[in-house]
């Protein structure tokens, strides 16, 4: 049997399989030792017993997508049954007071492979032996402590298969510069050891793609705003805007980014290279924010053109290699190409409240001569639209340790002038964090007051 | 002269539904928050529901969470309380009120029987 | 059971000073204004004190509102015949979430 065979149906183009080499991966026309890896069907019933007290999963992700030439990570974790885990020396042992369907196991291990290793024999002096092979029959790499890793991952995809000796967690990087753009699939089959050969345990796939647009995200922030993730905001209030580019792999650190805003709002184009930018929108309504990335990225150089045909003989103007047409290609060239990213986002423009401000405040006299706890009024004032929730929380002077959160719906008028009592149970200095807030808005405002004792000639301070 | 007109109210079997309204007049309906309020006969006040000037918040009594809704529309000036599942206890005058923190003017109610 | 506590009843002959109290917890008076409302036979409440002790124009200065910790009171001087109605009180109560009224005071005027 050759790998495509084994490891999946979907058979790329032979374009694709002639072309589109990946460094350090191998053709899928090669073929596979079944003695040493055995191949089973969907639905077999020899899956059930392939693993010691269940199945084992396997879980594929990658950090797709992937702007074409940089590197896409792909990362494999292996889930084992409940109660077990993989040690130190990569066995597989139960953990300790856990029970699962068969109760508490008196054997430790589930697999013991390092006591397998130690019994085998048939191995020359370099460790090296005919079982110590991959699928395809190239030896292992001896890595130190190499026999620790007693799982086998083939990756299989775009009619090429890479293969890893790994413990219960590979990961493998992939440059995609010879990759075609778009979704491609990514297969894995789990191989374990088992004496001599190997007993497959999971096979698991996954969606990556790649792209020649940058991938592009925005993150929007303003103060007041009650809910950054419904892309409503204030009016009268700066947004600002964060652009973060998908670039795991760091392909874009040397390029320089340039970030083209449409804020939808008649106020024109706005071009930088920094990637946050504030903008405010003094208007209510619905706009179209539009974001254009361009980067100059490493990529493939255009072919060079072909040279003149002088139509008679001309003297050469100086030595060999001076031509500078000989000089626009040369072996190791680095040649840029300019890659571009979008963003669009509706944003709603609504009225908010923007600003609250403690005007004063003010000890209530109680009717009792020596009442336990002091009545404080604060008298606040606010900007913008009419809020119908006040919270004040209550806390020690470092503002840090709550001592108590009171919310309740105010009616305000359109002057916005109200006053908040609140309890204060025993003299000192409390840190007052008080906000106002409607729908879409909550505004802060917080201040420092210092209650006395209950000694009716002690004035009430704002702390500084 | 600030006027709150409830109407809606009836009999309505068990498990019915029964739509409240409340027209308002003689202040700005849109910028301030309304709320309901009930009281059973021979009974002392029990708040219903509360709701914000723009209609973006809205609060409940537990004893009618989940059945009751609040609504308004600023265009006709009009507060509005669905009733579904009723119960015989949710029997008694329904009062519109205005405001929320305290309910500084009060409609003549209408009465919600719940009988079969 | 209300979440505030009211009397059931008061009463006092004209003239006199009646005092109807209102005792809650530090999540409704203690931390939020307090409210009353009278409600003559046969007709919708009508608010009396707002904001603890403020009187909305058109209530007369016999009525009087005061608040200590988390205990509040109504008190009328130079009670009257048509004095005689329910009084509720009523606050916010922040860890609830919901509007809480008293079970209400019967005020009767003797005499």
């Known amino acids: 049997k050759r790998f495509h065979d084994v490891l999946g149906n979907e058979r790329p183009s032979a374009y694709m399989r002639e072309h589109n080499q990946l460094n350090g991966w191998s053709s899928d026309e090669n073929d596979w030792n079944e003695k040493l890896y055995p191949v089973w069907k969907r639905g077999d019933m020899r899956w059930k017993n392939s693993w010691k007290g269940g199945r084992v999963q396997a879980v594929l992700t990658s950090d797709s997508p992937a702007l074409v030439g940089s590197n896409i990570t792909f990362a494999v974790n292996l889930i084992f049954p409940r109660c077990q885990k993989e040690d130190a020396n990569g066995n597989i042992v139960y953990e300790k007071n856990c029970r699962n369907e068969a109760g508490l196991s008196a054997d430790p291990y589930v697999y013991n492979w390092t006591a397998w290793s130690e019994d085998s024999d048939g191995e020359n002096g370099t460790g090296q032996s005919h079982h110590n092979v991959f699928p395809d029959g190239k030896p292992f790499p001896h890595h130190p402590g190499w026999r620790r890793w007693n799982f086998i991952y083939v990756f299989h995809t775009l009619g090429q298969y890479f293969q890893k000796l790994g413990r219960c967690s590979v990961r493998v990087s992939v440059n995609t510069a010879n990759v075609t753009l778009g979704p491609q699939l990514m297969e894995v089959t789990v191989y374990r050891r088992h004496g001599r050969a190997y007993v497959p345990i999971a096979q698991v796939k996954d969606v990556y793609v790649v792209t020649d647009q940058i991938p592009v995200f925005v993150t929007m922030f303003q103060k007041n705003d009650r809910n950054s993730s419904d892309e409503t905001f204030l009016k009268d209030l700066p947004i600002m805007f964060d652009v973060l580019i998908h670039d795991p792999s760091h392909f874009l650190n040397y390029s320089t980014i340039n970030y083209k805003w449409s804020f939808g709002d008649n106020t024109g184009l706005f071009v930088s290279t920094n990637h946050t930018v504030n903008h405010t929108y003094v208007l209510n309504g619905t706009f179209s924010l539009n974001l254009t990335v361009k980067a100059a990225a490493p990529g493939p150089c255009p072919p060079p053109p072909p040279p003149p045909r002088p139509s008679k003989p001309t003297p050469s103007l100086g030595p060999a290699g001076d031509n500078p047409l000989e000089l626009s290609r040369i072996p190791d060239e680095n040649c840029q190409i300019n890659r571009y990213g979008h963003f669009q986002a509706t944003i709603t423009i609504v009225e908010g409240i923007l600003e609250v401000n403690i005007i004063q405040m003010t000890d209530v006299l109680m009717p009792v001569p020596w009442p336990e706890s002091s009545l404080i009024d604060f008298v606040v004032t606010c900007q913008g639209s009419i809020p119908t929730e006040v919270c004040t929380i209550i806390s020690d002077p470092t503002c840090e340790i709550t001592q108590n959160t009171v919310c309740s719906p105010v009616d305000v008028d359109e002057m916005c002038l109200l006053t908040v009592r609140r309890t204060f149970n025993g003299s000192g200095t409390y840190c007052v964090n008080l906000t106002l807030g409607d729908d879409t808005s909550l505004a802060l405002t917080s201040t420092l007051i210092s209650v006395p004792d209950r000694d009716p000639a002690s004035p009430l301070r704002m702390a500084n | 002269e600030v006027q709150l007109l409830e109407s809606g109210g009836g009999l309505v079997q068990p498990g019915g539904s029964l739509r409240l309204s409340c027209a308002a007049s003689g202040f700005t309906f849109r910028k301030l928050n309304m709320s309901w309020v009930r009281q059973a006969p021979g009974k002392g006040l029990e708040w219903v529901s509360s709701i914000s000037h723009s209609g973006g918040s809205k609060y409940y009594a537990d004893s009618v969470k989940g059945r009751f809704t609040i609504s308004r529309d600023n265009s006709k000036n009009t507060l509005y309380l669905q009733m579904n599942s009723l119960r015989a206890e949710d029997t008694a005058v329904y009062y519109c009120?205005?405001?929320?923190?305290?309910?500084?003017?009060w409609g003549q109610g209408t009465l919600v029987t719940v009988s079969s | 059971q209300s979440v505030l506590t009211q009397p059931p009843s008061a009463s006092g002959t004209p003239g006199q000073r009646v005092t109807i109290s209102c005792s809650g917890s530090?999540?409704?008076?203690?931390?939020?204004?307090v409210s009353w409302y009278q409600q003559l036979p046969g007709t919708a409440p009508k608010l009396l004190i707002y904001?603890?002790?403020q009187r909305p124009s058109g209530v007369p200065d016999r009525f009087s509102g005061s608040k200590s910790g988390t205990s509040a009171s109504l008190a009328i001087s130079g009670l009257r015949s048509e004095d005689e109605a329910d009084y509720y009180c009523g606050a916010w109560d922040s860890s609830l979430n919901a509007y809480v009224f008293g079970g209400g005071t019967k005020l009767t005027v003797l005499g």
């Open positions: 904001a603890d002790s």
């Open positions: 530090s999540s409704n008076i203690g931390n939020n204004y």
């Open positions: 009120a205005r405001k929320w923190s305290t309910f500084d003017y």
